[in-house]
């Protein structure tokens, strides 16, 4: 007879503690760091994942790339404040009372300020551009095969509705995946493009968030697709508000 404890895991989030003590002995999983209950039938929100990650700190990885209107996650890891639904709170502050506003994917979209800083609303990131460079291969990948494989990946592994994968561009060795999802398009139960992009980013880095699944093995017509660098650009429904000093730096 299999122990309940053995069957009680969260397939979509290994950074959880699970026990079969929910209603009627349901397996109930809580995110590390926040202790919030998570729905293991779908992706966990990026905010809760970041919080869990900070509760068991590893080497911080950061991306630094200037851009015009697109935001890049230059600040790297931080311990975020999440709302009761697991979304990022619009205003984030650190232990030294330095505060800033973030978008729906938790990326800073204003200059840093003090506790008086106001962030009126959580601005939605409606367009994400994932920029990949793959390792050299014998020849270029067939564009339509690559397109189909990446769309399948986002549909099957991340459960993102196909309509939110707007395009896949390819100019060897650069691959660009465009995700688009306006507030009005996102229905209840839809995976958020920000969460899907974060799971993909962690997969690409060999840090899969899925429980017990092997790492990401991306193949196009049997040929391994090995990514050597990733950049993710975030475009918000309302442009970010940075001082001119930062924009001209």
């Amino acid at each position: 007879h299999t122990a309940a404890q053995d069957n009680c895991t969260c397939p979509t989030n290994k950074m959880t503690v699970c026990s079969p003590d929910g209603p009627g002995g349901r397996c109930q999983c809580r995110a590390l760091g926040s202790g919030m209950a998570v729905d293991c039938s779908t992706l966990t929100s990026k905010c809760l994942l970041l919080k869990a990650r900070m509760s068991a700190p590893k080497n911080a990885r950061t991306l630094v790339r200037p851009s015009e209107h697109a935001l890049v996650d230059n600040d790297g890891l931080y311990d975020p404040d999440c709302d009761p639904e697991g979304r990022f709170k619009a205003r984030q502050c650190n232990q030294t009372s330095v505060c800033w506003c973030v978008n729906s994917v938790g990326v800073r979209r204003t200059d840093k300020g003090d506790l008086s800083l106001r962030c009126d609303e959580l601005v939605r990131t409606h367009h994400i551009l994932i920029d990949l460079r793959h390792r050299p291969t014998a020849g270029a990948f067939n564009h339509s095969d690559l397109d189909a494989e990446l769309r399948r990946l986002f549909r099957e592994r991340y459960r993102l509705h196909p309509k939110f994968v707007a395009a896949v561009h390819y100019e060897q060795p650069t691959i660009q995946i465009e995700l688009r999802q306006n507030t009005s398009q996102k229905a209840a139960g839809d995976v958020d493009i920000g969460d899907a992009a974060y799971y993909f980013e962690r997969d690409i880095k060999g840090e899969s968030l899925f429980q017990g699944r092997g790492g990401l093995d991306l193949r196009v017509r049997g040929e391994p697709l090995q990514v050597e660098r990733t950049l993710i650009y975030y475009l918000d429904e309302i442009p970010p508000k940075f001082s001119m000093k930062r924009l001209t730096a």
Epitope: A4, Q5, N7, P23, G24
Partner: antibody, heavy 116, light 107 residues
Framework: QVQLVQSGAEVKKPGSSVKVSCKAS????????INWVRQAPGQGLEWMGQ????????HYNQKFQGRATLTADKSTNTAYMELSSLRSEDTAVYYC?????????WGQGTLVTVSS | DIQMTQSPSSLSASVGDRVTITCKAS??????LSWYQQKPGKAPKSLIY???RLVDGVPSRFSGSGSGQDYTLTISSLQPEDFATYYC?????????FGGGTKVEIK
């Protein structure tokens, strides 16, 4: 195989307390929740509460909050349900049931009669 | 609390009949629904859990279906040993709540 053996029938006076036991065997006691359900004569099933011996966490039906106490003794693999301030409406068969994801194994039931 | 409305409260049927019992929740319960069979003087017995999963050892003539607020237990061909009372249970949230029961009697 999974077995839940409950204590025998009880006759109690109004205002007194009753403690029903449920001895589990055939599985690891701390891995599953135990729920308590009662059934008044000729009536349907009514959920009273749930205890998880693994962490001693519990949930009660608000109706029994303050009157019912669920406990678990890990050394003897036994769950207990104590109901105080008994009244005639508490006359019922009391069941313990091991649950996992809604799938239940039930004890044989304990008849508690409250009568003056 | 989530209310579970079970219907009918009783029904008469013959051996070989197809029998359908329904349970309606006062709100969506995400398929967290079980069905139990109880015979007089006996403890309930699990038939179905998670709305449509058959418990090991339960005959395949029993099946569960539904989603959201509406769920159904079907007995495809009623057998003599199936005459009993059937209960649904929601375990989407605390407190767990049972339907009022359906008594299946011989016509």
């Amino acid at each position: 195989q999974v077995q839940l053996v409950q204590s025998g029938a009880e006759v109690k006076k109004p205002g007194s307390s009753v403690k029903v036991s449920c001895k589990a065997s055939g599985y690891r006691f701390t891995d599953y929740v135990i729920n308590w359900v009662r059934q008044a004569p000729g009536q349907g099933l009514e959920w009273m509460g749930q205890i998880y011996p693994g962490s001693d966490s519990f949930h009660y039906n608000q109706k029994f909050q303050g009157r019912a106490t669920l406990t678990a003794d890990k050394s003897t693999n036994t769950a207990y349900m104590e109901l105080s301030s008994l009244r005639s409406e508490d006359t019922a068969v009391y069941y313990c049931a091991r649950f996992f994801e809604g799938l239940a194994y039930w004890g044989q039931g304990t008849l508690v009669t409250v009568s003056s | 609390d989530i209310q579970m409305t079970q219907s009918p409260s009783s029904l008469s049927a013959s051996v070989g009949d197809r029998v359908t019992i329904t349970c309606k929740a006062s709100q969506g319960i995400n398929n967290y629904l079980s069905w139990y069979q109880q015979k007089p003087g006996k403890a309930p017995k699990s038939l179905i859990y998670r709305a449509n999963r058959l418990v090991d050892g339960v005959p395949s003539r029993f099946s569960g279906s539904g989603s959201g607020q509406d769920y159904t237990l079907t007995i495809s061909s009623l057998q003599p040993e199936d005459f009993a009372t059937y209960y649904c249970l929601q375990y989407d949230e605390f407190p767990l709540t049972f339907g009022g029961g359906t008594k299946v009697e011989i016509k």
